[in-house]
């Protein structure tokens, strides 16, 4: 059973390689357990970047992932990916699964294109 997941189409990472974007879903029923997965699409392949399960008591996620963090509030997840470099530029998709109570609902956003520009190295100063 499907839910609609929305995320911004484009985000520019900061000069420190940090990109933040929201991932929202609807409809939202009273949900005890929400699983959020960030996937990166390259060509026809999807690779998992990070995943976490949010609950009423656990609203801060991705504790097992050094490059991801996120907070959960009602039907919105604020995602942050750090440590990004130019080679990480690509399409990042947010997948949301409503795990409890049933029925199971799942939805995938259209993706956020994250652009990462490596900072210019500082010129040596004599």
């Amino acid at each position: 059973e499907a839910i609609q997941v929305t995320q911004p189409s484009v985000v520019l990472a900061s000069s420190h390689g940090v990109a933040s974007f929201p991932c929202e879903y609807s409809p939202s029923h009273n949900t005890d357990e929400v699983r959020v997965t960030v996937l990166r699409q390259t060509n026809d392949q999807m690779t998992e970047v990070c995943a976490t399960t949010f609950t009423e008591k656990n609203t801060v996620g991705f504790l097992d992932y050094p490059f991801c963090s996120g907070t959960f509030n009602e039907s919105r997840v604020n995602l942050t990916i750090q440590g990004l470099r130019a080679v990480d530029t690509g399409l990042y998709l947010c997948k949301v699964e409503l795990m409890y109570p049933p029925p199971y609902f799942v939805g995938m956003g259209n993706g956020t294109q994250i652009y990462v520009i490596d900072p210019e190295p500082c010129p040596d100063s004599d």
Partner: antibody, heavy 117, light 107 residues
Amino acid sequence: EVQLVESGGGLVQPGGSLRLSCAASGFTFSSYYIHWVRQAPGKGLEWVASISSYADYTDYADSVKGRFTISADTSKNTAYLQMNSLRAEDTAVYYCARQSYYGLDYWGQGTLVTVSS
Amino acid sequence: DIQMTQSPSSLSASVGDRVTITCRASQSVSSAVAWYQQKPGKAPKLLIYSASSLYSGVPSRFSGSRSGTDFTLTISSLQPEDFATYYCQQLSRGPSTFGQGTKVEIK
């Protein structure tokens, strides 16, 4: 039309085993939790176990933990309750039920398990 | 495990009476509580889910409410077909539990 049909009940000796089946139809089986609930003669409802195939999750009442195993075959839309080391106090009508949100909205007709020598 | 303490265990009432049954959870279960009606030899029927939502096809004289860990089933005007046994159930994540049941009998 949503339907749950239990089968597999019967008379078994103490220490014996029995496997109950719950055949589901009329809904997407894999999107729901299935529960087993029992009722001893003249007594109240007792929750036994639950399973979610999509979440790969099972849970049991303390009274049956280690003796009963709940499982599901999504290709057959069927949930099972394997009951081992049966005792006289396991004698009851066993119901399977579907959980939707915070309630069991569809129940089977029940199957009677009698544990006696 | 979370315990559900249901009261009273039985009550006698007349047609037209207002009937209240209470369940107290031993710890917080949010709104994860359901109420059922059961008649002899039959499977239970869902009346209220998510503490206060009326299940489809259930008469509006049935209602559910929550105050902290206390959950209440109210029948506003008892009808002849309402004489039965009523159970609460908590369905928060983890093992589920039922209340002991309340038998509603004719006075």
